[in-house]
C-alpha cells in the first residue's frame, strides 16, 4: 500500500521522499524565506481501507510575509492554550487542549494568516462529555458576571462575578458548573 505524490506547495518545498511512498511515511513542508507556512507542516501517508494510501490532511500553504499582520487572542470555551503567546504575528501558531471532561472537535492548531484571521481551519471547539448543562446564571444588581459563553453552560466552566465601584461582593466570586448540571454556589450579591 502506498500514497501518490504529496500535494505540491507554491513558494515552498517538500522534504525528501522515495517512491513508492509507504504507509507511515511523513513528508514535511517548508516555505521560502519571505513566506510563512499556514497549516500543519507534516503530512502522513495512511490507509483507510487497507487497499489504497492517502495523505491524512491537506497540504499547508505559503503566504507572502505580511509584517503588519496581527491576530486577536483566540478564545476556545472549555479549552486552553498549550502553545503560542501574544503578540500573534503572521505565521505564528496557537495550539489548544480541552479542559477535563471536554473533548475536542476540529484541529487543535490554528495559524495567524496575512488577513489577520486564524486559519486555515476554524478554531477548535471543546464539547462537554456530559449531556447535562447548568442553566444561565442571573445578572446581579450593581454587578456583572463574565462567562466563557452565553446561555446554558457546560460542566467544568465557571462564571466570575464582580461589583461596580462602591459596592462589596458578598458570597462566592467564582461559581463552577458541576458535572451534575448544578452550580457550585448561589449567585453573590453586591452591597453598599
Amino acid at each position: 500500500i502506498s500514497c501518490g505524490s504529496p500535494p505540491p506547495i507554491l513558494n515552498g518545498r517538500i522534504s525528501y521522499y522515495s517512491t513508492p511512498i509507504a504507509v507511515g511515511t511523513v513528508i514535511r513542508y517548508s516555505c521560502s524565506g519571505t513566506f510563512r507556512l499556514i497549516g500543519e507542516k507534516s503530512l502522513l501517508c495512511i490507509t483507510k481501507d487497507k487497499v489504497d494510501g492517502t495523505w491524512d490532511k491537506p497540504a499547508p500553504k505559503c503566504e507572502y510575509f505580511n509584517k503588519y499582520s496581527s491576530c486577536p487572542e483566540p478564545i476556545v470555551p472549555g479549552g486552553y492554550k498549550i502553545r503560542g503567546s501574544t503578540p500573534y504575528r503572521h505565521g505564528d501558531s496557537v495550539t489548544f487542549a480541552c479542559k477535563t471532561n471536554f473533548s475536542m472537535n476540529g484541529n487543535k492548531s490554528v495559524w495567524c494568516q496575512a488577513n489577520n484571521m486564524w486559519g486555515p481551519t476554524r478554531l477548535p471547539t471543546c464539547v462537554s462529555v456530559f449531556p447535562l448543562e447548568c442553566p444561565a446564571l442571573p445578572m446581579i444588581h450593581n454587578g456583572h458576571h463574565t462567562s466563557e459563553n452565553v446561555g446554558s453552560i457546560a460542566p467544568g466552566l465557571s462564571v466570575t462575578y464582580s461589583c461596580e465601584s462602591g459596592y462589596l461582593l458578598v458570597g462566592e466570586k467564582i461559581i463552577n458548573c458541576l458535572s451534575s448540571g448544578k452550580w457550585s454556589a448561589v449567585p453573590p450579591t453586591c452591597e453598599e
Epitope: R13, S15, Y16, Y17, V23, G24, R28, S30, L44, I46
Partner: antibody
C-alpha cells in the same frame, strides 16, 4: 510531560528473541508516535523503527527489517519492540522515545532497557 | 539513508568558555534537525529542534543554527553540568543520528 517506563534488563542467548515494553502515562497515547532507538556500549544512537498507535502503522530501518517487530496496545498505553535472531552485536541499551504527533524529534525518552546477548 | 557526521569527536573546553559543535548532513535536510544531550547512564535529552528552536526548559546558553547540510550547536558559557555527549538527528527522511561529540572539561 509524558512519562515512558520500560521493562527491566534481559539476558538472552544468541538466536533467541527479546521483547521490551514501554508504558506511557500522561498525554494521549494514540496521538503520538513511539520510536525505538538502541545504543551499543560506548557507541552512538541508532534508530530501529517506530509505530503510530492510533493507526497501528509500524515502519522499520532497513538494517532491522525482518528482524524487528514493533506493536502497541492502546488499551494499556504500551508499546513493544521484539527483536529476533539475536546475536552478540545486539547487546545494547534499548530506548523508547516519543514524538508529539509526527514532529520528527523526541521530547520524551524511556529510561532504557539493557539487553545482553551472551552464550 | 541520510548520513549525519559530527565534528569533532571530542572537544575539550574550559568552564565559562564557548563551545561550538558541528553536524553535517549527507544531503540537504532543510531545517529538520534536532540536538540532544546525553550524560552517562541517562537517556538523551532534547535541546534543540527545527535546527534553532530551544526545547521547553532548555537554558538560553544553548543555541542552534544552520540549514541545508551544515548545522551548529553553540553553548555560550559552559557550566559544569554541560559536559556530556551531544548528538544531532535528522528527520527530513526517516531518522538518523550523528555519531556524537563528547564535550569534556579542559
Amino acid at each position: 510531560q509524558v512519562q515512558l517506563v520500560q521493562s527491566g534488563a534481559e539476558v538472552k542467548k544468541p538466536g533467541s528473541s527479546v521483547k521490551v515494553s514501554c508504558k506511557a502515562s500522561g498525554g494521549t497515547f494514540s496521538t503520538y508516535a513511539i520510536s525505538w532507538v538502541r545504543q551499543a556500549p560506548g557507541q552512538g544512537l541508532e534508530w530501529m523503527g517506530r509505530i503510530i498507535p492510533i493507526l497501528g502503522i509500524a515502519n522499520y530501518a532497513q538494517k532491522f527489517q525482518g528482524r524487528v517487530t514493533i506493536t502497541a496496545d492502546k488499551s494499556t498505553s504500551t508499546a513493544y519492540m521484539e527483536l529476533s535472531s539475536l546475536r552478540s552485536e545486539d547487546t545494547a541499551v534499548y530506548y523508547c522515545a516519543r514524538e508529539d504527533d509526527i514532529s520528527g524529534y523526541y521530547q520524551d525518552w524511556g529510561q532504557g532497557t539493557l539487553v545482553t546477548v551472551s552464550s | 539513508e541520510i548520513v549525519m557526521t559530527q565534528s569533532p569527536a571530542t572537544l575539550s573546553v574550559s568552564p565559562g568558555e564557548r563551545a561550538t559543535l558541528s553536524c553535517r548532513a549527507g544531503q540537504s535536510i532543510n531545517s529538520h534537525l534536532a540536538w540532544y544531550q546525553q550524560k552517562p547512564g541517562q537517556a538523551p535529552r532534547l535541546l534543540i529542534y527545527d535546527a534553532s528552536t530551544r526545547a521547553t526548559g532548555i537554558p538560553a546558553r544553548f543555541s542552534g543554527s544552520g540549514s541545508g547540510t551544515e548545522f551548529t550547536l553553540t553553548i555560550s558559557s559552559l557550566q559544569s553540568e554541560d559536559f556530556a555527549v551531544y548528538y544531532c538527528q535528522q528527520y527530513e527522511y526517516w531518522y538518523t543520528f550523528g555519531q556524537g561529540t563528547k564535550l569534556e572539561i579542559k
